[in-house]
Amino acid sequence: VPPGEDSKDVAAPHRQPLTSSERIDKQIRYILDGISALRKETCNKSNMCESSKEALAENNLNLPKMAEKDGCFQSGFNEETCLVKIITGLLEFEVYLEYLQNRFESSEEQARAVQMSTKVLIQFLQKKAKNLDAITTPDPTTNASLLTKLQAQNQWLQDMTTHLILRSFKEFLQSSLRALRQM
């Protein structure tokens, strides 16, 4: 069924394997647990979590965000548009997750686990979306220059960037989880 069109009393195009939904759900919850641990270290290490200067750092970032048009909210829900947005968003977050590596002292392994688990989640979701239109992958050259730019920031901005990435990723995953439970 093309996005935005009604399904007119037709059999659903494919029957899902019974385990795929559970794997996706557990994977997202596992990543969210990892993010919580990383946020704990970030918040303990600096006062970024209470800072009101987030807008300054946010100007440098183009973090994926759920919007009404993406079809992932209860109002205006569109499962196919939404699934494409979730996968596209996760692919766009990968460069930011790469940036997070080496940003943690006591939670270095946790940062790696979040990154690796996200890659696995993308694979699970791509299987679920196999009947949907091709999903655009971020340009590696653009990602490389973004990473360089982020790593060249001063310490305060780097700390703020870390905090904003974790917060945005958490919000994105929570919205994704709610939407995916309907699918």
Partner: antibody, heavy 119, light 106 residues
């Protein structure tokens, strides 16, 4: 008032077919996954099937896979369960249920429709 | 499929009693739900995700537990609570239900 109303139940011979309907009213149908759950006379509850809000994904219990088909007509806010190759053990009250947004809970249920498979 | 075993299968209690129903899963489950069903009626959601009270459900109902062992508690049984209670789990499809616990008047 938020409600689901099932219809289409009745007496059918083994091997026969039946199509159940579930009409939704009092809420916006489009964002919710829908389910069928059945209850044999004097027995407990058994989950049968789920369909995603736009009909792209369906899930079935092993007992009905390849015999039952779940579909939607979103323009009519109605879900359907096409039941083929019916067996005596399919005799039950069939409930349709709405899945709570953002959770796996089934929060709104219809009153049920009785399907009797007997010769 | 994950098996859910409820205990007891039935119980007799008086108005005002504290009632506890347990649900044991064959393996660890992701989410647990509790439903109330009265004769000839559809099931009604009481508790979702282990311990969240469904909309419009009185606070005398509560759910707890994790992993394989879960409990539904009615802190002070009311006349309208005499019914059959089912636990239900989701850990991927299929959803499965317990066999039910019938709460009768003593």
């Amino acid at each position: 008032e938020v409600q689901l109303v099932e219809s289409g139940g009745g007496l059918v011979q083994p091997g026969g077919s039946l199509r159940l309907s579930c009409a939704a009213s009092g809420f916006t149908f489009s964002p919710f996954a829908m389910h069928w759950v059945r209850q044999a006379p004097g027995k407990g509850l058994e989950w049968v099937a789920k369909i995603s809000p736009g009909g792209s994904w369906t899930y079935y219990s092993d007992t009905v896979t390849d015999r039952f088909t779940f579909s939607l007509d979103t323009s009519k806010s109605t879900a359907y369960l096409q039941m083929n190759s019916l067996r005596a053990e399919d005799t039950a009250v069939y409930y349709c249920a709405r899945q709570l947004w953002g959770y796996y809970a089934l929060d709104i249920w219809g009153q049920g429709t009785l399907v009797t498979v007997s010769s | 499929d994950i098996q859910l075993t409820q205990s007891p299968s039935s119980l007799s209690a008086s108005v005002g009693d504290r009632v506890t129903i347990t649900c044991s899963a064959s393996i660890s489950v992701s989410y647990m739900y509790w439903y109330q069903q009265k004769p000839g009626k559809a099931p009604k959601l009481l508790i979702y995700d282990m311990s969240n009270l469904a909309s419009g459900v009185p606070s005398r109902f509560s759910g707890s537990g994790s992993g394989t062992d879960f409990t539904l508690t009615i802190s002070s049984l009311q006349p309208e609570d005499f019914a059959t209670y089912y636990c239900m789990q989701w850990s991927g499809y299929p959803y499965t239900f317990g066999q039910g616990t019938k709460v009768e008047i003593k």
